[in-house]
């Protein structure tokens, strides 16, 4: 529950549409855990691609592309009875507006692929 | 490349630490694609847990927890020679500060689990 139960939630309609944001990030070191190699060891491996946009904060976002159409089995062969699919997440970024050197930003939603997982098809069909 | 090459990048040291942010979200409908059922169909299925915090924007974030230690095989049995692991991503959220009804927020990093994938162990050992 909120520390101030009377405060409007930032998602409420009556909440101010423009707020002040401090860019000194808290929890800056959440990424201190070693970089995972799951992208290589997964049965649905992926490559990471750098998406860079200087008008955005953060300016660099890494996105996943599935390497295979099917999934890698225990023998290292691709099984096309299964599908490698991207796991997507909606994230919030700050977009500089109105596109000149101001300190004004707007929240923007981005749908990013974070990694891949192996799923069973639900439709059986003959190729 | 930036539309204004002379503009400081928001990650530069000389960029103002406090900026104005418009909360009217652009690209609000990136999630218009149908909700995916991969969490159930994956060989490393997961459950989604609601993480709610009214002092944060967005106040609701869904987090994945892998259902199994191993991965589900073609027969629906759990294979413990493989591991279900969470795919994690660092996201930015806005944290209300200094924790009373102000329009001031601070960027905060959160490490969230978005889904699970099935990986091969790198250490083989006998139990």
């Amino acid at each position: 529950s909120p520390q101030n139960p009377g405060c409007p939630n930032a998602e409420d309609k009556n909440f101010p549409r423009t707020v002040m944001v401090n860019l000194n990030i808290r929890n800056r070191n959440t990424n201190s855990k070693r970089a995972s190699d799951y992208y290589n060891r997964s049965s649905s491996p992926w490559n990471l691609h750098r998406n860079e946009d200087p008008e955005r904060y953060p300016s660099v976002i890494w996105e996943a592309k599935c390497r295979h159409l099917g999934c890698v089995d225990a023998d290292g062969n691709v099984d096309y009875h299964m599908n490698s699919v991207p796991i997507q997440q909606e994230i919030l970024v700050l977009r500089r507006e109105p596109r000149h050197c101001t300190n004004s930003f707007r929240l923007e939603k981005m749908l990013v692929s974070v990694g891949c997982t192996c799923v069973t098809p639900i439709v059986r069909h003959v190729a | 490349s930036p539309q204004n090459p002379g503009c400081p990048n928001a990650e530069d040291k000389n960029f103002p630490r406090t900026v104005m942010v418009n909360l009217n979200i652009r690209n609000r409908n990136t999630n218009s694609k149908r909700a995916s059922d991969y969490y159930n169909r994956s060989s490393s299925p997961w459950n989604l847990h609601r993480n709610e915090d009214p002092e944060r924007y967005p106040s609701v974030i869904w987090e994945a927890k892998c259902r199994h230690l191993g991965c589900v095989d073609a027969d629906g049995n759990v294979d413990y020679h493989m591991n279900s692991v969470p795919i994690q991503q660092e996201i930015l959220v806005l944290r209300r500060e200094p924790r009373h009804c102000t329009n001031s927020f601070r960027l905060e990093k959160m490490l969230v689990s978005v889904g699970c994938t099935c990986v091969t162990p790198i250490v083989r050992h006998v139990a």
């Epitope: 599935c66 390497r67 159409l69 799923v119 098809p121 639900i122 439709v123 059986r124 190729a127 | 694609k33």
Partner: nanobody, 125 residues
Framework: EVQLVESGGGVVQPGGSLRLSCADS????????MGWFRQAPGKEREFVAA????????YYADSVKGRFAISRDTARNTVYLQMNSLKPEDTAVYYC??????????????????WGQGTQVTVSS
């Protein structure tokens, strides 16, 4: 609505070659697997070949295996279908699609979308 644009079709003799292109001018599908399909008069659209988002993996219908090769150029946002040793039964309108769903296996036509107008391939002597 975003659409893919196919080109490169034409009339060719049996045993000849053609290279089809599928352009994604908006860069909308650089993270999607892509597929080529074909539709002959009076028949349903059928799967020909597919390629993964990274280009590392390809899959072919049995009828074209060893003769056709799918590839993608990420810099140009284009997917290609190199067709060799063409046969009269390859005559059809060829379409490319972006894989947007995963209800079926890789050759399931309904999992693909954003078709273009297609490009006609005619194999005839």
């Amino acid at each position: 609505e975003v659409q893919l644009v196919e080109s490169g079709g034409g009339v060719v003799q049996p045993g000849g070659s053609l290279r089809l292109s599928c352009a994604d001018s908006e860069r909308s599908f650089s993270f999607n697997a892509m597929g080529w399909f074909r539709q002959a008069p009076g028949k349903e659209r059928e799967f020909v070949a597919a390629i993964s988002a990274t280009g590392d993996d390809t899959y072919y219908a049995d009828s074209v295996k060893g003769r056709f090769a799918i590839s993608r150029d990420t810099a140009r946002n284009t997917v290609y279908l190199q067709m060799n040793s063409l046969k009269p039964e390859d005559t059809a309108v060829y379409y490319c699609g972006a894989r947007v769903n995963f209800d079926g296996t890789v050759s399931y036509t309904n999992d693909y979308a954003y078709w273009g107008q297609g490009t006609q391939v005619t194999v005839s002597s």
